[in-house]
């Protein structure tokens, strides 16, 4: 197979014919050293998936349900290119499956039993697979046949295409369950009409259905969406209140050696030459031979799927949960409203050891999952492999953009017993230098810098945000002569100062000796000119408070703070000499797990929190000898957020604005994936 050939998989004669035409037309417009198309014909999409996994083909376009099959072992395929719909300016690559109800009704998602339901059709994504998959564990047993369980769950339904003889209740609202537009309640508009007419109490449709059927906002305002957290929202708020986000049509490839760059190069060129309204001779998004061949006729173009986005992230936790429930038919033994153990995400093996000790002491109420970077942990929480972790504000922002929510805040200053209910203002992000140096905020260019990690608040977002507004470019590695900013590109000058050891050099976890607040300060002590840390870092690591060899003889008066006005002050005066106020670290979780996590953590801190005085013979949640493992060591308690329960509210407008501005300099692959 030529190096630059993409073997496209076709599933019918008509698709094969279009594929050959695609191949010939691409050959005519691309240079001889550019990508080329070869066509492989298989009997079905599943056969195509297997062929790609076996390296007999390279690419095929699939619906969401098949993307799930493609991701399962042993196939292990991943999404590489997405079709988009709508305009180039506002491309839609996903739709949202929603549960619509009338505003004057008063039930929530967990009160659907005994209601009347309207569905688009049996086996369809938004109308059946997703809602029934998510409700699966609430259905009465036996859950097979599924139609019977659903019939016994709702008090009456319209499920077009269902068997009305065997399951008459499923056709109660539309006699015969007609499987075409002859049934007035068929498909999206029909299911919505079923609700509108008062036949049903809830309609399972797409987010756009309401807008397509009700042009008038006043009419739309008579309806609401049911959210999975048992609240309701307006129909405009579908991004924050849906059953699942469903990818429309996606090109998949192998996860390893999958030619994704080549596939993108090919499709990008293809849309330039043969996309919507581009060419008379060949059209990528239509065909005289049939409908939706190779690509959907309704597609307007392609978007490259960010490399960090695997199939789990692409399909989303809710969609995968729904499909897995339907396919595997398994439900937890415990009732779904009971808190299962909370899986904490630990960074590298040091945090894992502390987490394991916590797990043992919690009698298994806490379980542990590990990842090598904070972003990998956030991804694991998103896809359900983990449930929670405590994050610096910079990562609370990324987690929030990825759909996670803050649950509890770390408090550092409020003594018990008021701590749990107190909202602290935050801590100070400061720039620390040696007293013996002549550095000021205005002459840092060309100096050696020490950072907690890329993407963290005090160590990166605040100082680099301020720097960006001064230098107006993102080449921070050129501004400083060298430095240690864990998480930077390994060949960057901002990894030059890091200590490692070797395979972990510049890694954003505790295996890198200069990682985190204490690590950045150590970097200043041993090699650097300036360290960007929290205001408590110097006091916490001097005067013998840190027993490690490098720190035990350090004196607080040997260090000073840089003020933004060009002056310097004692480390005792952070309130008058800081870069900005930083939001406290916070615990994040998926929305569906937030209440569980909060309840369990409040209980855990009563047993293992700062009320424990002897940490040498008892487990202490907020202690790890200055290493800030799992939580900051100076945490007094985890505090309730009250109404600050979204990442925007928690971080505050000013900080969100600062981080959003820095996004043009972002090196976060996860953030890129979550904002796709």
């Amino acid at each position: 197979v030529p190096e630059k050939s993409v073997r496209w998989c076709a599933v019918s004669e008509h698709e094969a014919t279009k594929c050959q035409s695609f191949r010939d037309h691409m050959k005519s417009v691309l240079p001889s050293n550019g990508p080329s198309v070869a066509c492989v014909k298989k009997a079905s999409h599943l056969d195509c998936i297997r062929a790609i996994a076996a390296n007999e083909a390279d690419a095929v376009t699939l619906d969401a349900g098949l993307v799930y099959d493609a991701y399962l072992a042993p196939n292990n395929l991943k999404p590489v290119v997405a079709e988009f719909y709508g305009s180039k300016e506002d491309p839609q690559t996903f739709y949202y499956a929603v549960a619509v109800v009338k505003k004057d009704s008063d039930f929530q998602m967990n009160q659907l039993r005994g209601r009347k339901s309207c569905h688009t059709g049996l086996g369809r994504s938004a109308g059946w697979n997703i809602p029934i998959g998510l409700l699966y564990c609430d259905l009465p047993e036996p859950r097979k046949p599924l139609e019977k369980a659903v019939a016994n769950f709702f008090s009456g339904s319209c499920v077009p295409c269902a068997d009305g003889t065997d399951f008459p209740q499923l056709c109660q609202l539309c006699p015969g369950c007609g499987c075409s537009t002859l049934n007035q309640y068929f498909s999206y508009s029909g299911a919505f009409k079923c609700l509108k007419d008062g036949a049903g109490d809830v309609a399972f449709v797409k987010h756009s259905t309401i807008f397509e059927n009700l042009a008038n906002k006043a009419d739309r305002d008579q309806y609401e969406l049911l959210c999975l957290d048992n609240t309701r929202k307006s129909v405009d708020e579908y991004k924050d209140c849906h059953l699942a986000r469903v990818p429309s049509h996606t090109v998949v490839a192998r996860s390893v050696g999958g030619k994704e760059d080549l596939i993108w190069e090919l499709l990008n060129q293809a849309q330039e030459h043969f996309g919507k309204d581009k060419s008379k001779e060949f059209q990528l998004f239509s065909s005289p031979h049939g409908k939706d061949l190779l690509f959907k006729d309704s597609a307007h173009g392609f978007l490259k799927v960010p490399p960090r986005m695997d199939a789990k992230m692409y399909l989303g936790y809710e969609y995968i949960t729904a499909i897995r429930n339907l396919r595997e038919g398994t439900c937890p033994e415990a009732p779904t409203d009971e808190c299962k153990p909370v899986k904490w995400c630990a960074l590298s093996h040091h945090e894992r050891l502390k987490c394991d000790e916590w797990s043992v002491n919690s009698a298994g109420k806490i379980e542990c999952e590990s990842a090598e970077t904070t972003e990998d942990c956030i991804a694991k929480i998103m896809n359900g492999e983990a449930d929670a972790m405590s994050l610096d504000g910079g990562f609370v922002y990324i987690a929030g953009m990825c759909g996670l929510v803050p649950v509890l805040a770390e408090n550092y200053n409020t003594p018990n017993p008021n701590c749990e209910n107190t909202a602290e203002e935050g801590y100070f992000a400061v720039a620390v230098v040696k007293s013996s140096s002549d550095l000021t905020w205005d002459n840092l260019k060309g100096k050696k810098s020490c950072h907690t990690a890329v993407g963290r608040t005090a160590g990166w977002n605040i100082p680099m945000g301020l720097l960006y507004s001064k230098i107006n470019h993102c080449r921070f590695d050129e501004f400083f002569s060298e430095g240690c900013a864990p998480g930077s590109e390994k060949n960057s000058s901002l990894c030059k100062l890091c200590m490692g050891p070797s395979p972990n050099l510049c890694e954003p976890n505790n295996k890198e000796g200069y990682y985190g607040y204490t690590g950045a300060f150590r970097c200043l002590v041993e090699k650097g000119d300036v360290a960007f840390v929290k205001h408590q870092t110097v006091p916490q690591n001097t005067g013998g408070k840190n027993p490690d060899a490098w720190a035990k003889n350090l004196k607080e008066e040997d260090y000073e703070l840089l003020c933004l006005d060009g002056s310097r002050k004692s480390v005792q005066e952070p309130a008058n000499c800081h870069l900005a106020r930083a939001p406290n670290h916070a615990v994040v979780a998926r929305k569906d797990k937030a209440d569980c996590v909060q309840t369990l953590l409040l209980d855990q801190q009563r047993m293992f929190g700062s009320s424990v005085t002897d940490c040498s013979s008892n487990f202490c949640l907020f202690e790890s000898k200055t290493k800030d493992l799992l939580f900051r060591d100076d945490t007094v308690c985890l505090a309730k957020l009250h109404d600050r329960n979204t990442y925007e509210k928690y971080l505050g407008e000013e900080y969100v604005k600062a981080v959003t501005n820095l996004r043009k300099c972002s090196t976060s692959p996860l953030l890129e994936a979550c904002t796709f």
């Epitope: 050891l353 502390k354 000790e357 043992v360 040498s616 487990f619 790890s624 000898k625």
Partner: nanobody, 117 residues
Framework: QVQLVESGGGSVQPGGSLRLSCAAS????????MAWYRQSPGKQRELVAG???????NYADSVKGRFTISRDNAKNTVYLQMNSLKPEDTAVYYC???????????WGQGTQVTVSS
């Protein structure tokens, strides 16, 4: 310097039993949570069972009902009684005392357990 010495490993047939011991000696008395870990080739070290200072225990799902952890504080020793052994229990077993810190590598040599017919 603290030393943790594991013993009691060996080869056994599926369904058989073994009792592992771990003695802590040196400058720090064992006063905190202790645990048994295991590591098989190419896999991460995983927590098998733990026991708090007060004697509360916790087990990995894969060994629940088959393994029992216990301790003798006077002897600074922790035990792992392993019954109904399976081939997938084959690994090197290590013990740790969490009071030694999460950073210093205080792992002992470990003791090999092999389960095969």
């Amino acid at each position: 310097q603290v030393q943790l010495v594991e013993s009691g490993g060996g080869s056994v047939q599926p369904g058989g039993s073994l009792r592992l011991s771990c003695a802590a000696s040196g400058s720090i008395a064992s006063i905190n949570t202790m645990a048994w870990y295991r590591q098989s080739p190419g896999k991460q070290r995983e927590l098998v069972a733990g026991i708090t200072r007060g004697g509360s225990t916790n087990y990995a799902d894969s060994v629940k009902g088959r393994f029992t952890i216990s301790r003798d504080n006077a002897k600074n020793t922790v035990y792992l009684q392993m019954n109904s052994l399976k081939p997938e229990d084959t690994a090197v077993y290590y013990c740790t005392d969490y009071s030694l810190g999460y950073y210093q590598d205080y792992w002992g040599q470990g003791t090999q357990v092999t389960v095969s017919s």
